[in-house]
Interface confidence: low
């Protein structure tokens, strides 16, 4: 069966029907490049006016304008608010009332696209494997990133959160139109990774999405993550304004000037430093969501009533912090270089600025307890990674899970830890799952490109797709079309239950109280220490000549080393910059 032309609010769209085997039978309808909104520079998105005739939705559109990986050029375009849909079909009747999974990509709110990194037309966020294996509809889309998506003066002149509003427009479009594609508009799951995971969290908290979202999955990121909300947007807006020659004293004049500045110039006016700075790298993530009093009306911690009826899966990778540790403490990955106590204390201090010396000392003390018995470099380096993982991912996720559970009415809450080790051969032997390592498994790459993977990788992928799509279908990762390797029990406040996702998932994979000692430290001991200064009061942006991001290690089955500079070609984005 196949859909043919589908009538949407904008007009007819026609995709392609891809047979899953030479013998016919099952297939997937694929629609690429359906416009869901339009937007002017640094303004809120608007509904797309539609089109005449039938839109041929057969090619991915360009990503939203962003810096290349070397941060010395741009690619993508401003006209970028398009979405892609995968609809699984059986042999006889067209599908109807299928669960819908809407993907929000990561990339530090700075980079990324709805199709993800590609190598020889193999796109990371190709929804086919999820759709066909889980019998769900998959939707991916672009949203604005970097200064164009998140620049804010902290007032009504440039409220910011344009990228978040793009995401909302995509979700709302799906709600209004997905029934025509065979989807159930009352069963929408949004899922995302890193900045996309924090976006998922923020979308569930925003009053704008009331009634739109049934379930949500956040992979390595939350609204409560320290890198997810910009508390000092004006500081960064002025930094950009100065670089492009706009006035900075009056926010009205600054906003007016920025809106008519060349979008490429705005994009290139900001560079994320990846050479070690005074503070940890995440402090330099400037253009991220803000509390605008409207889309995000309050501090996210105060908005959890809005998630009372949204089922939630949230989890992290067991070494999510590794990617950031390698920037903040470069010796972590270098076998011939040593990490010193001073290195670690500087890192700790950078993450505990608000609590001053007492905060840094208390944090250093608890994290270095094991160094007395095991002062090896391996243990010290693992501590650095564990610390970054805790601060940036684990603690915010655990707090969010507890908040979700505490405010839940009908909602169910599930937690996981992804522990399948990274396949990067250059990593240390003790390496676990790095930031963004989970993406390839959720999107079924071990099946789509089998030669690049082992049977154990396919086992991980099969399990994750089964749990994820069962959850989308029923709100319970165990119940749906796909058998699962073991029962995943809900998170409870008493036991902090979580599923440890590895190559062999058994009953013993259901665990509880992940890093309880450290969670208690952050939630109790650290929390009660007196606050001495705002998080970023002393932060100074890096100098203009600071080194720009090199290509980080990435999954070599997905990525080629150098992105093409020709803007007409879809450029590659390393999967590991997921954030």
């Amino acid at each position: 069966a196949k859909l043919g032309a589908v009538y949407t609010e904008g007009g007819f769209v026609e995709g392609v029907n891809k047979k899953l085997s030479l013998l016919g039978g099952d297939s997937v309808d694929i629609f690429k490049g359906i416009p869901f909104a339009t937007a002017k520079t640094l303004e809120n998105p608007q509904r797309h006016p539609g089109w005449q005739g039938t839109l041929k939705a057969t090619n991915f559109k360009k990503r939203c304008l962003q810096a290349t990986i070397t941060q010395d050029n741009t690619y993508g375009q401003e006209d970028c608010l398009y979405l892609n849909i995968w609809v699984p079909q059986g042999r006889k009747q067209v599908s109807h009332n299928l669960p819908v999974m809407v993907w929000i990509y990561g990339g530090a709110f700075l980079m990324g696209s709805g199709q993800g990194a590609n190598f020889l037309k193999n796109y990371l966020y190709d929804g086919e494997e999820i759709a066909t294996r889980g019998n769900v509809i998959v939707v991916t889309f672009n949203y604005r990133v970097g200064p164009l998506g998140f620049l804010s003066t902290g007032d009504a002149n440039l409220p910011g959160n344009f990228g978040l509003r793009d995401q909302h427009m995509a979700i709302a479009w799906v709600k209004r139109n997905i029934a025509a594609f065979g989807g159930d508009p009352d069963n929408i799951t949004i899922f995302g990774e890193s900045a996309g995971a924090a976006s998922v969290s923020l979308q569930t908290l925003s009053p704008y999405n009331k009634g739109l979202i049934r379930r949500a999955i956040s992979q390595s990121g939350m609204a409560l993550s320290p890198w997810a909300i910009q508390k000092n947007p004006l500081f960064w807006a002025k930094t950009i304004a100065k670089k492009v020659g706009c006035p900075t004293e009056d926010t009205g004049k600054m906003a007016a000037c920025l809106k008519i500045t060349d979008p490429r110039a705005l994009t290139l006016a900001y560079k994320l430093p990846v050479k070690k700075q005074e503070y940890p790298v995440v402090h330099y993530l400037a253009f991220i969501p803000v509390i605008d009093g409207d889309f995000i009306p309050d501090d996210p911690i105060n908005l959890y009533n809005n998630t009372a009826d949204i089922d939630y899966i949230a989890g992290i990778n067991n070494m999510d912090g590794h990617l950031f540790a390698t920037i903040d403490v470069p010796a972590v990955d270098k076998t011939k270089q040593t990490v010193t106590e001073e290195d670690f204390y500087r890192l700790v201090s950078g993450h505990t600025v608000a609590k001053g010396l007492k905060g840094a000392q208390a944090t250093f003390d608890i994290y270095t307890e094991s160094w007395a018995q095991d002062p090896s470099q391996e243990n010290m380096k693992k501590t650095v990674v564990a610390f970054e993982t805790d601060v940036l991912f684990l603690i915010p996720t655990e707090i969010a899970l507890a908040q979700h559970k505490a405010h839940a009415k009908s909602a169910k809450t599930y937690s996981y830890l992804f522990s399948h080790p990274s396949r990067m051969p250059i990593y240390p032997k003790w390496m676990g799952a790095d930031h963004a390592d989970d993406l390839q498994y959720v999107f079924g790459k071990p099946f789509a490109t089998p030669l690049g993977y082992r049977p154990q990788d396919r086992a991980v992928s099969k399990a994750m797709i089964a749990y994820w799509t069962n959850f989308a279908r029923s709100g319970d990762p165990n119940m749906g079309n796909s058998p699962v390797p073991t029962h995943w029990y809900p998170y409870t406040l008493e036991n902090g239950n979580y599923l440890d996702i590895t190559k062999t998932i058994t009953s013993a994979s259901m665990k509880e109280h992940l890093r309880e000692k450290f969670l208690k430290f952050w939630a109790v001991t650290f929390e009660v220490l007196p606050t001495v200064t705002g998080d970023q009061d002393t932060l100074t942006p890096p100098e203009d000549d600071s080194e720009v991001a090199p290509d980080p290690p990435s999954d070599d089955s997905q990525v080629v080393p150098v992105p093409p500079t020709d803007d007409s070609v879809e450029a590659q984005m390393p999967a590991t910059i997921g954030f």
Epitope: K405, S410, N478, M479, H487, Y489, S507, A508, K511, E512
Partner: antibody, heavy 119, light 105 residues
Framework: QVQLVQSGAEVKKPGASVKVSCKAS????????MHWVRQAPGQGLEWIGV????????SYAQKFQGRVTMTRDTSTSTVYMELSSLRSEDTAVYYC????????????WGQGTLVTVSS | DIQMTQSPSSLSASVGDRVTITCRAS?????LNWYQQKPGKAPKLLIY???RLPSGVPSRFSGSGSGTDFTLTISSLQPEDFATYYC????????FGQGTKLEIK
């Protein structure tokens, strides 16, 4: 501490219905599933079904489908198990049992309620 | 439904003995739990997830196995251990073994 207190023994005639209650205390009632298990005299344990007190969702063993109804009252932290069309072979001690955690076995049990079906 | 078969059905042993009870599932399972029941009392959770001991259960009890074959071992029988032991699989429709009665020799 966790406590599950069940209602008292019942004697019923064949064809009648019985409703057994299980009052929970010492924990957050809506955070754990509640199961019902029975044990006929001198026999082994038999799982009847489970209820999620949070939303009232139920799952019953195939054998009891159509005859059993599990409900809950969150205001009193009580779950109920009603078995209809009773027959003599339903004579048994009926236990409520709360999920533990992790692999979620039956970690806490009520004291049991003897239901006798006799004409 | 998955059938659970315990062996032996009954067993006589003395205080201090090492005792092993086995449980076989009719098809591969993920979860296996063991319970102890004394006459007139409700069952008590002894081991969960094949090998994990809940707090308060003495360390002389241990469990092992995976797939279809599982074992409960009591390393040194104590007087209070004489009881009936049940295995149970956790799936969408849990089932118990028929029980193993452990008696004093």
């Amino acid at each position: 501490q966790v406590q599950l207190v069940q209602s008292g023994a019942e004697v019923k005639k064949p064809g009648a219905s019985v409703k057994v209650s299980c009052k929970a205390s010492g924990y957050t009632f809506t955070s754990y599933n509640m199961h019902w298990v029975r044990q006929a005299p001198g026999q082994g344990l038999e799982w009847i079904g489970v209820i999620n007190p949070s939303d009232g969702a139920t799952s019953y063993a195939q054998k009891f489908q159509g005859r059993v109804t599990m409900t809950r009252d969150t205001s009193t932290s009580t779950v109920y198990m009603e078995l209809s069309s009773l027959r003599s072979e339903d004579t048994a001690v009926y236990y409520c049992a709360r999920d533990y955690y992790g692999s979620s076995p039956l970690g806490y049990w009520g004291q049991g309620t003897l239901v006798t079906v006799s004409s | 439904d998955i059938q659970m078969t315990q062996s032996p059905s009954s067993l006589s042993a003395s205080v201090g003995d090492r005792v092993t009870i086995t449980c076989r599932a009719s098809s591969s399972i993920s979860y296996l739990n063991w319970y102890q029941q004394k006459p007139g009392k409700a069952p008590k959770l002894l081991i969960y997830a094949a090998s994990r001991l809940p707090s308060g259960v003495p360390s002389r009890f241990s469990g092992s196995g995976s797939g279809t074959d599982f074992t409960l071992t009591i390393s040194s029988l104590q007087p209070e251990d004489f009881a009936t032991y049940y295995c149970q699989q956790r799936s969408s429709s849990p089932t118990f073994g028929q029980g193993t009665k452990l008696e004093i020799k």
